[in-house]
Interface confidence: low
């Protein structure tokens, strides 16, 4: 499977609220034995490989902004604590997966990433990996709500896994 | 079954460091969460940070940051806990443990604890 | 940090006895507690996950319920290997942190 990021670049008045996406592509394996780990974190430009640098958003790491199916559903020992930081992640059973940022500031632009691992236990993982970009505008000059930019369709399809 | 393994008991004087390791055998390493956990002759259990392998960063408690490192070693399955500046107080047994699901904080393996005693 | 206290710190009981044991939060921490058992100079062993899920091959006679900050740990009908150390634990924020423990000592 892959990761796609529909849109590469949002930009977004400060104070809005904004919905960061991507969508898991290609045969999905719903066996028994396989957990699929989703989670964000922020990272920053000009390295080797983007996304491989790990940054909390708004204090919160990757460990805090996990999604995880199959198997049980353990204690949510995160959902309290994203959204008093005004963060709130979220998956579909169609791949699409989330983090929604409430109540923006300047200091939340910068380049986010989504990170799947399928994990088959006892035996192997996979891991993959989106990138975008949150510019967040104050003064005359920004819009009035959102506005996103779609990817490339290059830019969707080559994902390197992590 | 999932089965984890700790180093020996060891014995420091004060000031110096103490490395522990706990190795994990018969399931996935990488993405389940190992933490330290200590427990003081005669006293309770305190957590001391955590970190899942797969990602390789891990979180501390703030009584201990800037005094212990954890870190894990993915080829091995072997996590790591460092603890500088020994006082006596350090005297303990220290466990890991791994998360039940993923990147929870509810400990369902534990090792079989390294007692470390800290003594001039 | 959040605080967890459990109550009592010790308790006498006889074989058949039900047992109740509290813990509280110094804030609301959902349903993000656990129970673990523990024997001397073993390490602990997780009894019940998520306040009340009770986790693989643990025993019925043990049960957990509460949310928010009070949480209960029941063992209906004690055994002679109960005889332990119980802890509580949140998980809902870091530092993750444990009561103080309660030594179930036989009668």
């Known amino acids: 499977f892959k990761v796609a990021t529909p849109y590469s670049l949002y930009v977004c008045p400060e104070g809005q609220n904004v919905t960061l996406t991507c969508r898991l592509l290609g045969p999905v394996d719903k066996g028994h034995d396989v957990t699929f780990y989703k989670t964000w974190y922020r990272s920053s430009r000009g390295e080797v490989q983007t996304c491989s640098e790990r940054r909390p958003i708004r204090n919160l790491t990757f460990q805090d902004l996990h999604l995880h199916h199959g198997g049980h559903q353990a204690a949510n020992t995160s959902h309290d604590l994203a959204q008093r930081h005004g963060l709130e992640s979220a998956s579909d059973h169609h791949g699409n997966f989330s983090i929604t940022m409430r109540n923006l500031t300047l200091l939340d632009s910068g380049l986010y990433c989504c990170l799947v691992v399928e994990i088959r236990h006892h035996h192997s993982e996979h891991r993959v990996h989106g990138a975008m970009e949150l510019q967040v505008q104050t003064g005359k000059d920004a819009p009035s709500n959102c506005v996103v930019y779609p990817s490339s369709s290059q830019d969707s399809e080559n994902i390197t896994a992590a | 079954q999932v089965q984890l393994v700790q180093s020996g008991a060891e014995v420091k004087k004060p000031g110096s460091s103490v490395k522990v390791s706990c190795k994990a055998s018969?399931?996935?390493?990488?993405?389940?969460?190992i933490s330290w956990v200590r427990q003081a002759p005669g006293q309770g259990l305190e957590w001391m940070g955590g970190i899942i392998p797969i990602f390789g960063t891990a979180n501390y408690a703030q009584k201990f940051q800037g005094r212990v490192t954890i870190t894990a070693d993915e080829s091995t399955s072997t996590a790591y806990m460092e603890l500088s500046s020994l006082r006596s107080e350090d005297t303990a047994v220290y466990y890991c443990a791994r998360s039940s699901y993923g990147w929870s904080y509810e400990f369902d393996y534990w090792g079989q604890g390294t007692l470390v005693t800290v003594s001039s | 940090d959040i605080q967890m206290t459990q109550s009592p710190s010790s308790l006498s009981a006889s074989v058949g006895d039900r047992v109740t044991i509290t813990c509280r939060a110094s804030q609301s921490i959902a349903t993000n507690l656990n129970w673990y058992q523990q024997k001397p100079g073993k390490a602990p062993k997780l009894l019940i996950y998520a306040a009340s899920s009770l986790q693989s091959g643990v025993p019925s006679r043990f049960s957990g319920s509460g949310s928010g900050t009070d949480f209960t740990l029941t063992i209906s009908s004690l055994q002679p290997e109960d005889f332990a150390t119980y802890y509580c634990q949140q998980n809902d924020d870091r530092p993750i942190t444990f009561g103080q423990g309660t030594k179930v000592e036989i009668k």
């Open positions: 018969g399931g996935t390493f990488s993405s389940y969460a």
